[in-house]
Amino acid sequence: FERTRSLQDPCSNCPAGTFCDNNRNQICSPCPPNSFSSAGGQRTCDICRQCKGVFRTRKECSSTSNAECDCTPGFHCLGAGCSMCEQDCKQGQELTKKGCKDCCFGTFNDQKRGICRPWTNCSLDGKSVLVNGTKERDVVCGPSPADLSPGASSVTPPAPAREPGHSPQ
């Protein structure tokens, strides 16, 4: 079957990094500069991605693979293939339309991205606050007052919260 297909479609013999050139009797021509083909049998080469401005080149384009971008210092990638760059903030801040703003009292952010999240409410688990929260760190919950007796189990900090979805631009 493969042999038959090759006889019927000469383009199937063109490897990655080339294209099947209709203008030249369907021979395999190398991809022109700034273009690539990542699979065989392609009739055109794709234009290489260019990383400009806040985007910078992480991996150069080759004849068989597209360029890859990341973000310049002070920004981080978002989206598939780093389609967007978002400004970093400091820990203890979140990004708003007006720039980086400190977390309000009772909330924290331990990353350079994302939004401020409420401190854990220890009392919901019947525990007490062992270490107070800050803008950068969640509270640490300890055993409930009733559990504070000799031989009580050691403190377990809360599981890290997953970054919530709705982060301001």
Partner: antibody, heavy 116, light 107 residues
Framework: QVQLVQSGAEEKTPGASVKISCKAS????????IHWVRQAPGERPEWMGW????????RNSQKFQGRVTITWDTSASTAYMELSSLTSEDTGVYFC?????????WGQGTLVTVSS | DIVMTQTPSSLSASVGDRVTITCRAS??????LAWYQQKLGKAPNLLIY???NLQSGVPSRFSGSGSGTDFTLTISSLQPEDFATYYC?????????FGQGTKVEIK
């Protein structure tokens, strides 16, 4: 061929919420972005936000912050956009679009009408 | 937010005419610009991405050029199916924004 199929038209009253679905099929990859764009009658399209199908990361335009929730159901290959506290100004067609760089594949659109 | 301004807002042309639509960004967006065609009651359709790259399946009579803040969409020879509204859109910084559109009508 990638296809995005959206849920049907909705009529809502002011203050209500609407939730629109966008099912992806065809040559979809493990990790791509679904964007939501709305278009009021006679107006330019307006970008609302996006979600990444791989890690669920999402961002919304500040204009809709606090009113829009975008989610992704991996098992159903479906994105959802919920808009709350609707007003008459939210009337329009809502599109989902897949992006591999530009918005290269679009859903057919969902008309949302908000009136009392 | 980056404001995208298209000119003209509308134009009348005949089949076979060469049509040029311009788009200006309020700040530099390098080559992060796309052009879409939209027909009444339909979703936008990607024509050009990264300023000058023709989307697969789009006729070669469409071309794009420019960089920085000023961009152009050209239709070399207008066809009956090209009468529609055209939008530019920047993807350099969020929120992604669109131009107000250029309606191409039959003269």
């Amino acid at each position: 061929q990638v296809q995005l199929v959206q849920s049907g038209a909705e009529e809502k009253t002011p203050g209500a919420s609407v939730k629109i679905s966008c099912k992806a099929s065809g040559n979809t990859f493990n990790n791509y972005d679904i964007h939501w764009v709305r278009q009021a009658p006679g107006e330019r399209p307006e970008w609302m936000g996006w979600i990444n199908s791989g890690n669920g990361d999402t961002r919304n335009s500040q204009k809709f912050q606090g009113r829009v929730t975008i989610t992704w159901d991996t098992s159903a290959s479906t994105a959802y956009m919920e808009l709350s506290s609707l007003t008459s100004e939210d009337t329009g067609v809502y599109f989902c679009a897949r992006a591999e760089g530009p918005l290269d594949y679009w859903g057919q659109g969902t008309l949302v009408t908000v009136s009392s | 937010d980056i404001v995208m301004t298209q000119t003209p807002s509308s134009l009348s042309a005949s089949v076979g005419d060469r049509v040029t639509i311009t788009c200006r960004a309020s700040q530099g967006i390098y080559n992060y610009l796309a052009w879409y065609q939209q027909k009444l009651g339909k979703a936008p359709n990607l024509l050009i991405y990264a300023t000058s790259n023709l989307q697969s399946g789009v006729p070669s009579r469409f071309s794009g050029s420019g960089s920085g803040t000023d961009f152009t969409l050209t239709i070399s020879s207008l066809q009956p199916e090209d009468f529609a509204t055209y939008y530019c859109q920047q993807s350099y910084s969020t929120p992604w924004t669109f131009g107000q559109g250029t309606k191409v009508e039959i003269k």
